[in-house]
């Protein structure tokens, strides 16, 4: 029961943490303009990751795309790769872990197979989380360099007494959207693979029935029965020829895969 | 057709307070920023304060913030200047204006005479 | 405050003839978010309200003659009247939209010769 409860969690926060990092990446508002000590402007910029916007007071608001993929800066193409690679991944996990949900039945697929694809899941949301938490920060730290230097050179003059104003910009709603939402997904991750442990069903052993023969002492131990999942080879039932039987202390537990997790 | 009709003008004494309003029509009043100007008489436009449309930002001319207030009314398509602490320099043609592109002042009222005096 | 300074104050105009007529702004008023330059430029006429002519500097509004144009960028702009007509006997004001408080010009009477 907590086991379901914990990958239910685990899917939920995930999918709320991925719409996050989608609102995010499509949010205008990754930067916008630093209002604190700056003389009071009837217009008032912003930029996303796609485009940039002017919201005037007229209420007036323009957006213009940026039409280039060349002209932009290494950095902005690589927040863009990461939000993006971040969603790819995260909607894949999604995808994953609905038909890994325990409380979903899917034809005759076996626990084991579930844990599986939880554990896969799980990491998708952990390494999809992580991308958009890096994403946000680079384009944070890239705002603060930026931010230090137009504060350096806040006004420049032109010729005496005309100035020109520098604007500069602050963090932006999306930066924390961003991070919170990346933190979701990588918490809905790390439940999922919690969970996947505790999905995995141990290894049944069965205490050794003899029967003792005329001439030989056989011994059947039954295994446990476990599905393939790709990760190992099967413990088959195994006949035991050994001359008599073993004692309880002497029978094998075969370790699950899921004890390394 | 877009209209802005300014009532509310007349004498008052220093020190006096008055209450203009103006009255909108043609547009939709509660998505369009609006403000009012003045005029001294022979004088250049002087702007004195603007209100945004949604959460109302307000912005005031230096020589008359605390003493004005500019206010909306939405479902009555009305805007309001509130003057207290009225002085002798605050006598104008006073116009309610819309704010439009640019933040341009596209459409004006014929204005209301505000005179202090004692 | 910005200080915006209009000149000539007054100019005497046949009709046909090109008019010009310059502002200055103490800072720019081009925003770096739209490369607009926030400059407008009103004709009033007497007894009337100002009229908007032009607003981000050069985009004429609606129903303005297209002989009125403006030019300019930064802190330097110009209204022209290619071919002023009697009608244009008015006082012409540029005004700043780009800091608060919003600021005009002293304006630019322009009389029939």
């Known amino acids: 029961m907590a086991v379901t409860a914990c990958q239910g969690l685990g899917f939920v926060v995930s999918l709320i943490g991925i719409a996050g990092i989608i609102a995010a990446t499509c949010m205008d508002q990754w930067s916008t303009q630093d209002l604190y000590n700056n003389p009071v402007t009837a217009v008032f910029n912003y930029q996303g990751l796609w485009r940039s916007c002017v919201r005037e007071s007229s209420g007036f608001t323009e957006c213009r795309g940026y039409f280039t993929l060349l002209g932009l800066p290494a950095m902005l193409q690589a927040v863009r790769a990461l939000m993006i690679v971040g969603i790819v991944l995260g909607a894949i996990g999604l995808l994953v872990s609905i038909f890994a949900l325990k409380c979903i039945r899917i034809g005759s697929m076996e626990d084991s197979a579930k844990a599986n694809m939880t554990l896969t899941s799980g990491i998708m949301f952990i390494v999809s989380g992580l991308c958009a938490i890096a994403g946000v920060s680079v384009f944070a730290n890239m705002l603060v360099t930026n931010f230090w230097m137009s504060t350096a050179n806040m006004y420049t003059g032109m010729g005496g007494m005309v100035q020109t104003v520098q604007t500069r910009y602050t963090f932006g709603a999306a930066l924390f959207v961003g991070w919170v939402a990346g933190g979701l997904t990588l918490i809905g991750g790390v439940m999922m693979c919690i969970a996947c442990r505790g999905l995995a069903p141990e290894e049944t052993n069965y205490k050794a029935v003899s029967y003792h023969a005329s001439g030989h002492s056989v011994a059947y131990k039954p295994g446990g029965f476990k599905a393939s999942t790709g990760f190992g080879s099967n413990t088959k039932n195994k006949k035991i020829y050994d001359g008599g039987a073993r004692t309880e202390d002497e029978v094998q537990s075969y370790p699950s895969k899921h004890d390394y997790v | 057709e877009v209209q802005l009709v300014e009532s509310g003008g007349g004498l008052v004494k220093p020190g006096g307070s008055l209450r203009l309003s103006c009255a909108a029509s043609g547009f939709t009043f509660s998505n369009s920023a609006v403000s009012w100007v003045r005029q001294a008489p022979g004088k250049r436009l002087e702007w004195v304060a603007t209100?945004?449309?949604?959460?109302?930002?307000?912005y005031y001319l230096d020589s008359v913030r605390g003493r004005f207030t500019i206010s909306r009314d939405n479902a009555k398509n009305s805007l309001y200047l509130q003057m207290n602490s009225l002085r002798a320099e605050d006598t104008a043609v006073y116009y309610c204006?819309?704010?439009?592109?640019?933040?341009?002042?596209?459409?004006w009222g014929q204005g209301t005479s505000v005179t202090v005096s004692s | 405050d910005i200080v915006m300074t209009q000149s000539p104050s007054s100019l005497s105009v046949s009709p046909g003839e090109r008019v010009t007529i310059s502002c200055k702004s103490s800072?720019?008023?081009?925003?770096?978010?739209?490369?607009?330059?926030?400059l407008t430029w009103y004709q009033q006429k007497p007894g009337q309200p100002p009229k908007l002519l032009i607003y981000w500097a050069s985009t004429r509004e609606s129903g303005v003659p297209d002989r009125f144009s403006g030019s300019g960028s930064g802190t330097d702009f110009t209204l022209t009247i290619s071919s002023f007509q009697a009608e244009d006997v008015a006082v012409y004001y540029c005004q700043n939209d780009y800091f608060y408080p919003l600021t005009f010009g002293a304006g630019t009477k322009l009389e029939l010769k």
């Open positions: 204006t819309r704010q439009f592109k640019g933040n341009a002042l596209d459409y």
């Open positions: 209100i945004t449309s949604g959460v109302s930002y307000t």
């Open positions: 800072q720019s008023l081009l925003n770096s978010g739209n490369q607009k330059n926030y």
